[in-house]
Interface confidence: low
């Protein structure tokens, strides 16, 4: 008799794929307009990335550092009207893209939460949650919560409002902190909170250190659903050595939890994201016309258009990973087991019941390596086969689909591999 199938866990929509942050409408649209109506025209592009949610804004009225001139219920007319927003919501819904609204109050000013009048601001947030939930928003984000006094209790209160309206609504909190204890204390009182932080960017970017960061975090958070990113708002290129971009895309898409990206991460867009410094958002490179002042053709391989036409590009890798992440049970909600590894690399298995299993091997080093993968520290339910099929490599030139011997696995510098193998009873 076949073994009984494991009960499927409850999956919320944000468990099923990546979230995509558009913090700056003008930067994202890159045509000088930057409004809600224009954003609607880019929903097909977001669909092609297979992202599940769009984290938008802030777009509310905010007079810099002025509590009275900050209205979380009003859209800044520079971005459009409430009608434009309603129309965006409707169009996004048709494409199965959820809208998460950033309500960080003083986003134009010095302190995101104003330095005084915390209670006044918290009340404004409460009112705004109720208002925008009624308007059909799928979730909210608040950033810089390290600047919010009594953040835990406020977050718990806001979470209650959000969940009270519907279990299907999401609250994301963002912090610049990379300290695990601080992060855990924020999570402690907020069961379903999704927290983005700088935890992973506080890294020496070696395989050993990354493995230790990831496993510590997963052990500390237990069976709570995680999110994975390198910061609460910035681009990957602002935190990572360029040669590790592809590796991190592979890792963020295959760790257990929700990967969270910023617009441009999919093409390797560069910009500043220096904590504590106000930075203008980068212009998204749609095609060569996105370089407003470039008189001769720039690098086409930096643009969405150029990368869309290149199967070996970062954008093509992003799309493939996003696709796998959204349809494979083992990647959607599978168990995670790290394998013993040397200083240069980090490898792990994702598996769910009798579904196809995935092995991720990441070489963080500047030199090629031979990784003999043995499953000495794996539970019986996650044993390793002798060979696994190569689903994709972060480097071009690999023969995809071919079986690779796991005891004699060779990786190029900074190469990541995603391999698959079947469940065997």
């Amino acid at each position: 008799r076949a073994p009984r199938c494991r009960d499927l866990p409850v999956q919320k929509w944000w468990h099923t794929g990546a979230l995509y942050r558009i913090g700056d409408l003008q930067g994202f649209q890159g045509n000088g307009a930057g409004n809600l109506a224009g954003l609607k025209g880019h929903l097909d592009y977001l669909s092609s990335l297979k992202v599940k949610g769009l984290v938008l804004g802030p777009i509310h009225k905010n007079q810099k550092d002025d509590v009275a001139g900050t209205d979380l219920l009003q859209i800044d007319p520079n971005f459009g009207s409430k009608e434009d927003f309603a129309s965006l919501l409707q169009s996004a819904k048709k494409k199965s893209i959820r809208i998460i609204l950033d309500l960080t109050p003083n986003y134009q000013g010095e302190n995101s939460w104003f330095s005084t009048q915390v209670d006044t601001v918290a009340t404004k947030v409460k009112d705004a949650l109720e208002f925008w939930l009624q308007a059909g928003v799928d979730g909210f984000q608040v950033r810089d919560i390290e600047n919010l006094k009594d953040a835990s209790s406020f977050l718990a209160e806001w979470q209650n409002i959000t969940k009270g309206f519907s279990e299907d609504r999401l609250l994301i909190a963002g912090t610049n902190s990379s300290d695990l204890q601080q992060i855990l204390s924020l999570l402690e009182s907020n069961k379903d909170l999704l927290l983005t932080s700088s935890y992973l960017s506080n890294s020496s970017f070696t395989g050993e250190h990354t493995k230790s960061l990831v496993t510590q975090y997963l052990n500390a958070t237990g069976n709570r659903w995680c999110s994975w990113s390198l910061s609460q708002a910035g681009l990957l290129t602002s935190f990572l050595p360029a040669q590790l971009l592809r590796l991190y895309q592979l890792m963020l898409f295959t760790l257990p939890g929700t990967p969270v990206f910023s617009y441009g991460d999919e093409i390797g867009l560069e910009a500043a994201a220096v904590p504590g410094q106000p930075v203008e958002a980068p212009v998204m490179l749609w095609d060569e016309s996105s370089f407003p002042f470039i008189s001769a053709a720039g690098s086409a391989n930096m643009t969405v258009k150029g990368q869309s036409e290149d199967p070996g590009s970062l954008l093509s890798l992003f799309r493939r990973l996003s696709d796998q992440r959204s349809k494979e049970r083992s990647l959607l909600h599978g168990d995670f087991h790290a394998l013993s590894s040397g200083p240069g690399f980090f490898s792990y298995i994702r598996h769910w019941d009798q579904n196809e299993r995935f092995l991720v091997v990441l070489n963080f080093g500047d030199v090629g390596l031979s990784a003999g993968l043995q499953a000495s520290d794996l539970p019986a339910s996650a044993s390793l086969p002798a060979k696994a099929d190569l689903l994709l490599s972060t480097q071009p030139g690999r023969d995809e689909g071919s079986p690779l011997e796991l005891e004699r696995l060779k990786l190029e510098p900074h190469e990541g591999l995603l391999l698959r193998f079947p469940y065997v009873a």
């Epitope: 560069e270 910009a271 500043a272 980068p282 002042f293 720039g298 690098s299």
Partner: nanobody, 125 residues
Framework: QVQLVESGGGLVQAGGSLRLSCAAS????????MGWFRQAPGKEREFVAT????????YYADSVKGRFTISRDNAKNTVYLQMNSLKPEDTAVYFC??????????????????WGQGTQVTVSS
């Protein structure tokens, strides 16, 4: 705010070399696309070269391609212009420019928010 200070200019014979430096302060340097421009007496300012934030992408004016090399050292907050096989027509004041909005760097001067004072390069025949 970004402050830019150029150095390394001077008088050199045709065929010779110079290395210009541009030191930046006041902001996260690695978040600036950088460019070099020049202005000869009685002429408009013209684009020379640009480099992206990380230094992975560079772009040159046709007139200097193959002779000039732009590079940057983000640890030292400095961008360089190595000028080889100099010609008399390279004589100009050379300006360094920083763009804080976009990492690519631009080939037209409207793209740059911050400028240095310039350094004089004179190539004699």
């Amino acid at each position: 705010q970004v402050q830019l200070v150029e150095s390394g200019g001077g008088l050199v014979q045709a065929g010779g070399s110079l290395r210009l430096s541009c030191a930046a302060s006041g902001r996260a340097f690695s978040s600036n696309g950088m460019g070099w421009f020049r202005q000869a007496p009685g002429k408009e300012r013209e684009f020379v070269a640009t480099i992206s934030c990380s230094g992975t992408s560079t772009y040159y004016a046709d007139s200097v391609k193959g002779r000039f090399t732009i590079s940057r050292d983000n640890a030292k907050n400095t961008v360089y212009l190595q000028m080889n096989s100099l010609k008399p027509e390279d004589t100009a004041v050379y300006f360094c420019a920083a763009d804080t909005r976009h990492c690519m760097g631009y080939t037209k001067d409207e793209g740059y928010a911050y400028w240095g004072q310039g350094t004089q390069v004179t190539v004699s025949s």
